[in-house]
Interface confidence: medium
């Protein structure tokens, strides 16, 4: 399987909400011993490998934001900790998973990474991630709503296996 990022750039005005999205592609083993660990974190564009550094999103680590379930099951983080920080991660039956950030400020600007780990028999088997940029803007040049820019065909299968 691999991870696609439908949009590589999100440009949003201050105060707006945004939902960053990744999509799980390819054959997904639905065996009872297979689960998927999905999460989000911030990173910086490292010279060697994008998304290699895992930094918190609004002080929440990738462990705080993770979803852990089988195949294309739906799930979401509804715990108070994430919601108090204006965050919610979710996953649907179609392989889409997302993080919603509310009330954006300039400090939310940066590189965001989604991570999917396939776990078999409690052992990590396969790990892929996708990356996207969030730019929060203010002033007369800021858009009135979030504007999203599709990934190029090469980027949309923004795959890095670990």
């Amino acid at each position: 399987f691999k991870v696609a990022t439908p949009y590589s750039l999100y440009v949003c005005p201050e105060g707006q909400n945004v939902t960053l999205t990744c999509r799980l592609l390819g054959p997904v083993d639905k065996g009872h011993d297979v689960t998927f660990y999905k999460t989000w974190y911030r990173s910086s564009r490292g010279e060697v490998q994008t998304c290699s550094e895992r930094r918190p999103i609004r002080n929440l680590t990738f462990q705080d934001l993770h979803l852990h379930h089988g195949g294309h099951q739906a799930a979401n983080t509804s715990h108070d900790l994430a919601q108090r920080h204006g965050l919610e991660s979710a996953s649907d039956h179609h392989g889409n998973f997302s993080i919603t950030m509310r009330n954006l400020t300039l400090l939310d600007s940066g590189l965001y990474c989604c991570l999917v780990v396939e776990i078999r028999h409690h052992h990590s088997e396969h790990r892929v991630h996708g990356a996207m940029e969030l730019q929060v803007q203010t002033g007369k040049d800021a858009p009135s709503n979030c504007v999203v820019y599709p990934s190029s065909s090469q980027d949309s299968e923004n795959i890095t296996a670990a």
Partner: antibody, heavy 113, light 111 residues
Framework: QSVEESGGRLVAPGTPLTLTCAVS????????MSWVRQAPGKGLEYIGV??????GPYYTSWAKGRFTISKTSTTVDLKITSPTTEDTATYFC?????????WGPGTPVTVSS | QVLTQTPSPVSAAVGGTVTINCHSS????????LSWFQQKPGQPPKLLIY???NLASGVPSRFKGSGSGTPFTLTIYDLECGDAATYYC????????????FGGGTEVVVQ
């Protein structure tokens, strides 16, 4: 809308000091807040910022370990962990990160034995 | 990050034009996270320009900011006596952690 700093005073080197920034007319859940200082006759120095929710705090490299920024629902605190004479300055609290659009009058801190 | 302002000091006559430059050792975030401030003795700084070229609320249009990435320029047209002050640029960076830095300041003398 206003911000006002307090807590500045004369302290001995090594004695921790906490400055408080009280805000009114706007919510800290909607604005990032920064701390900036200015030594007598010198330029502005950026210390760090704390964001909405619990984004940050983030510190400039020289300030890491020397300062701690925290907040409540209506105040933002700056703790000078172990002041030295070089920390003598006026400390400003400002609304925003780069777009610092609302400043307090500043609170003076003198570090001397 | 290092923000270098030139020149300092700078002087011009009433009605004249002053240009201040701000050069960053590294591009600011989004190429436009740069602000300009005016500070007079005994007062806190006042925001003039944000995101490189946006005029802050209540600031006369005589003040103009320009530039992208680095360098940046603040131009003051039709200089008035009240414009005598020290001007600072401040850049925002999002490499590793988010942080900012100020330039060293430029004193503007109005003759």
């Amino acid at each position: 809308q206003s911000v006002e700093e307090s807590g500045g005073r004369l302290v001995a080197p090594g004695t921790p000091l906490t400055l408080t920034c009280a805000v009114s007319g706007f919510s800290l859940s909607s604005y990032d807040m920064s701390w900036v200082r200015q030594a007598p006759g010198k330029g502005l120095e950026y210390i760090g910022v704390i964001g909405t929710g619990s984004t940050g705090p983030y510190y400039t490299s020289w300030a890491k370990g020397r300062f701690t920024i925290s907040k409540t629902s209506t105040t933002v605190d700056l703790k000078i962990t172990s002041p030295t004479t070089e920390d003598t300055a006026t400390y400003f609290c400002a609304r925003g990160w780069v777009k610092l659009d609302l400043w307090g009058p500043g609170t003076p801190v003198t570090v001397s034995s | 990050q290092v923000l270098t302002q030139t020149p300092s000091p700078v002087s011009a006559a009433v009605g004249g034009t002053v240009t201040i430059n701000c050069h960053s050792s590294q591009s600011v975030y989004n190429d436009n996270y740069l602000s300009w401030f005016q500070q007079k003795p005994g007062q806190p700084p006042k925001l003039l320009i944000y995101q490189a070229s946006n005029l802050a609320s209540g600031v006369p249009s005589r003040f103009k900011g320009s530039g992208s990435g680095t360098p940046f320029t603040l131009t003051i047209y039709d200089l008035e006596c009240g414009d005598a002050a020290t001007y600072y640029c401040a850049g925002g960076y999002n490499i590793g952690d988010s942080y900012s830095a100020f330039g060293g300041g430029t004193e503007v003398v109005v003759q």
